[in-house]
Interface confidence: medium
Amino acid sequence: APRGTQAEESPFVGNPGNITGARGLTGTLRCQLQVQGEPPEVHWLRDGQILELADSTQTQVPLGEDEQDDWIVVSQLRITSLQLSDTGQYQCLVFLGHQTFVSQPGYVGLEGLPYFLEEPEDRTVAANTPFNLSCQAQGPPEPVDLLWLQDAVPLATAPGHGPQRSLHVPGLNKTSSFSCEAHNAKGVTTSRTATITVLPQQPRNLHLVSRQPTELEVAWTPGLSGIYPLTHCTLQAVLSDDGMGIQAGEPDPPEEPLTSQASVPPHQLRLGSLHPHTPYHIRVACTSSQGPSSWTHWLPVETPEGVPLGPPENISATRNGSQAFVHWQEPRAPLQGTLLGYRLAYQGQDTPEVLMDIGLRQEVTLELQGDGSVSNLTVCVAAYTAAGDGPWSLPVPLEAWRPVKEPSTPAFSWP
């Protein structure tokens, strides 16, 4: 009877063999069948599931002249770069008429040196600060035991006797390398070597020491930096945005910060060229040969008000009998704060000085003592803020007021 036509008779004349090897191996599984009539398509199964995207080739050879003669069909499944996912039971499957035929199984196994699923990564850590490293490997064959190494020195007496997947490091004081070895029955695989760079700890206790209208002196406590001395610290100051910009934990300033470097020790720095009566935020980071620490939080600080840096401008003083009219303009020089008002002083020869607080007005009418016969009267004006008086103007002599007489207009008189 022709092959493949009876239920009990399998068409397969060659079944898949077995493959066992290490990762990356390339191998081929082969099955052969003899059928009468048109050759069927050969499907491959792994663990009972059809492989839709199998890398297989099918060769068909007729054994006679007639289409109804027997055919030899050979199907080859190529496994390139063997992986754990390729392992399992492989079979060939054909549909002949209303029947399904499956070959005897062949087995693909993986056995070799351990394979790393996870290896330790390079990272930076602050000195004396705990951290964890991860390493994970698998066979087969299992079990796989790990051995951690720090600066090429094993951290346990034998594989499997120390920490396995996660290594907890309580802290480092110098930059170190870590790797792990994976051991199984086939041998040893070594992971990549991770470099753990030890940076200085974040500085602490950043605070203000003293403040002037255009400068702030700040201090901080350096963090530990391991065996690497601090080379310098960097301080950044940025104008505050009325509380809308930087908050305590916000990582980056809203604008380009003013950056200053401080030699250390001392862990103190005078920040100059600031605006008076202005809120700033400051932060500090310290650097060793290994790199910089993380920044501290932004600390809000404020320069105090200063006194005005110049006297009022364009002072004019004119006198008419027992009255004098003085007026001036706001100082051109920086006020260094909020202008609260003006003080005015006037004095005649052999008479005591009279000091007046004018408030925010920029003119005043003075009632002079007597009949105005006091000679050599001079007047000075100063602007003031909450911080105090600015410089006084140079004395301005009170000039007698000389109206231009015209017949049609009466002479001007003070009210």
Epitope: S210, G243, Q247, P300
Partner: antibody
């Protein structure tokens, strides 16, 4: 290293003035910080009394304002507490301390002086 | 003035166990700049107070990380994760948001 060392009498008569000195080493009191006085009553309660700033300005607890004065001698790097018209209620341990400008955190303290007001 | 209230007034702890001390302020110590102006002091027997924590959660220089501070604007907690013999003393909270500076009544920590 900053150090604050206190001195002054341990016994003061009622209605008299209590005067204490705080001598600072390791930092100039006119270069920065607030220089505070705090007292601790026998029942452990702490009370801030006031400060003298590096720039010479003062701030006092309002409840003491009429009786307290904090002054300084920059040439000796010392600052002083004077509390007038004392009563037995002023019996306490008095501390001087350095405070930050933002916001008054006191990081270095003197050793404390126990003052008893009694006739 | 801002009133600071501490509880309990005393606490007894076994060595190696954790301890918590609470502090409450009569109004919020959260400044518009995002910082909370609360600090903790420890006064060991026969010594001056020493700064432990400032701005609610920042550890002062030289203070072991067994100490931690947390809280909201008005309710605060000091936690000691593993109490050691040297932690014995009176713990004070205080506010430095504004003058006059004010302190809590203190919590005495003892070892069982």
């Amino acid at each position: 290293q900053v150090q604050l060392v206190q001195s002054g009498p341990g016994l003061v008569k009622p209605s008299q003035s209590l005067s204490l000195t705080c001598s600072v080493t390791g930092f100039s009191i006119s270069s920065g910080y607030y220089w505070n006085w705090i007292r601790q009553f026998p029942g452990q309660k702490l009370e801030w009394m006031g400060y003298r700033s590096y720039d010479g300005s003062n701030n006092y607890d309002p409840s003491l304002k009429n009786r307290i004065s904090i002054t300084r001698d920059t040439s000796k790097n010392q600052f002083f507490l004077k509390l007038n018209s004392v009563t037995s209620e002023d019996t306490a341990t008095y501390y001087c301390a350095r405070g930050w400008l933002l916001h008054y955190t006191m990081d270095y303290w003197g050793q404390g002086t126990t003052v008893t007001v009694s006739s | 003035d801002i009133v600071m209230t501490q509880s309990p007034s005393s606490v007894s702890v076994t060595l190696g166990q954790s301890a918590s001390i609470s502090c409450r302020s009569s109004r919020s110590l959260l400044h518009s700049n995002g910082f909370t102006y609360l600090y903790w002091y420890l006064q060991k027997p026969g010594q001056s107070p020493q700064l432990l924590i400032y701005q609610m959660s920042n550890l002062a220089s030289g203070v072991p990380d067994r100490f931690s501070g947390s809280g909201s604007g008005t309710d605060f907690t000091l936690k000691i994760s593993r109490v050691e013999a040297e932690d014995v003393g009176v713990y004070y909270c205080g506010q430095n948001l504004e003058l006059p500076l004010t302190f809590g009544g203190g919590t005495k920590l003892e070892i069982k």
